[in-house]
Amino acid sequence: EPPTACREKQYLINSQCCSLCQPGQKLVSDCTEFTETECLPCSESEFLDTWNRETRCHQHKYCDPNLGLQVQQKGTSETDTICTCEEGLHCTSESCESCVPHRSCLPGFGVKQIATGVSDTICEPCPVGFFSNVSSAFEKCRPWTSCETKDLVVQQAGTNKTDVVCGPQDRQRA
């Protein structure tokens, strides 16, 4: 009886274990007892990234500039094109089908991680002793000014959105 399963990189058809086509090639005809599987290379704008029995290659992804996309890595017969976003934008999903502007961190929040083409800005609340008074996609929380090092005293306490206000020390005699 014929085998019910074939080895890796093979498929069973008409009681024959036929070789799958290698990445970058598509199936033209199945094997026979006397001939191996017939495969043809994908055209320049197409790819197949696995050992396969596909009769059509997949079209390379189009990085649409109208959606803010640009080519990060050109596709080959074995790999799809990889898109990324233009400067100031990041992908809306893992497959990077469209882009949106990087988010800015509001006052009271600083940038924990600057955005990339594939990930948005990550913001964090400014902890005690730090502040951010701007809406920015780049600025981290900054430390409050140290009045003491300037021989000044705190006249107004700092918040997560404002720096401390320093002023001169009172020169009262005891």
């Epitope: 009886e1 014929p2 085998p3 074939c6 080895r7 990189k9 093979q10 009681s15 024959q16 274990c17 070789s19 086509c21 290698q22 090639q25 007892e33 006397f34 001939t35 191996e36 599987t37 017939e38 495969c39 043809l40």
Partner: antibody, heavy 123, light 107 residues
Framework: EVQLVESGGGLVQPGRSLRLSCAAS????????MHWVRQAPGKGLEWVSG????????HYADSVKGRFTISRDNAKNSLYLQMNSLRAEDTAVYYC????????????????WGRGTLVTVSS | DIQMTQSPSSVSASVGDRVTITCRAS??????LAWYQQKPGKAPKLLIY???YLESGVPSRFSGSGSGTDFTLTISSLQPEDFATYYC?????????FGGGTKVEIK
């Protein structure tokens, strides 16, 4: 250890017969097609015959068709080549070779070879 | 039968050299081509199958390319143990056929 070991070669007169054997070990013999490939002294490689895992696909090179018979005994993990009506041009080292595929003896490539057995046909 | 033509028939090279061997099929064979290495008095050893796939345990300095009728075996940096004869073989159609071999010799 995965290996193939051929035996049965020797000096034989033209027109006589010889039977080669190949003992397989270290792999599931009845999962694979098997072949005989020969190499005349100082020459290149020539495929002689192939047999599928189940012996239902058996094929020969034109140069040996009608004179040589390939067979296998899966229970004994053994491959055989019965060579009749030997000619001087059959003089060669005969290699037993494993095919990574199973279902045809008509084509394939060879991922494991024995060390070979020399057959000399001379009067 | 499909004829396989290898060139050159021999090549002299030094350790560290890049060596390229070509194999041409008389008919289109997709990518169904294997390459073997044979040392004197030894059995052939499979290096590459499906034109470009390295057999397990074979050093990465060996690489294969090509599709259709024209194929190449490249040794990127020749090592002392690489001096041997190399054969291509088509397994696209019956019967399997080999190239005539290329002997890589020490210069």
């Amino acid at each position: 250890e995965v290996q193939l070991v051929e035996s049965g070669g020797g000096l034989v007169q033209p027109g006589r017969s010889l039977r080669l054997s190949c003992a397989a070990s270290g792999f599931t013999f009845d999962d694979y097609a098997m072949h005989w490939v020969r190499q005349a002294p100082g020459k290149g490689l020539e495929w002689v015959s192939g047999i599928s895992w189940s012996s239902d696909s058996i094929h020969y090179a034109d140069s040996v068709k009608g004179r040589f018979t390939i067979s296998r005994d899966n229970a004994k993990n053994s491959l055989y080549l019965q060579m009749n009506s030997l000619r001087a041009e059959d003089t060669a080292v005969y290699y037993c070779a494993k095919d990574p595929t199973a279902t045809t003896g008509a084509r394939g490539y060879f991922d494991l070879w024995g060390r070979g057995t020399l057959v000399t046909v001379s009067s | 039968d499909i004829q396989m033509t290898q060139s050159p028939s021999s090549v002299s090279a030094s350790v560290g050299d890049r060596v390229t061997i070509t194999c041409r099929a008389s008919k289109v064979i997709s990518s169904w081509l294997a390459w073997y290495q044979q040392k004197p008095g030894k059995a052939p050893k499979l290096l590459i199958y499906a034109a470009s796939y390295l057999e397990s345990g074979v050093p990465s300095r060996f690489s294969g390319s090509g599709s259709g009728t024209d194929f190449t075996l490249t040794i990127s940096s020749l090592q002392p143990e690489d001096f041997a004869t190399y054969y291509c073989q088509q397994h696209s159609s019956f019967p399997p056929t080999f190239g005539g071999g290329t002997k890589v010799e020490i210069k």
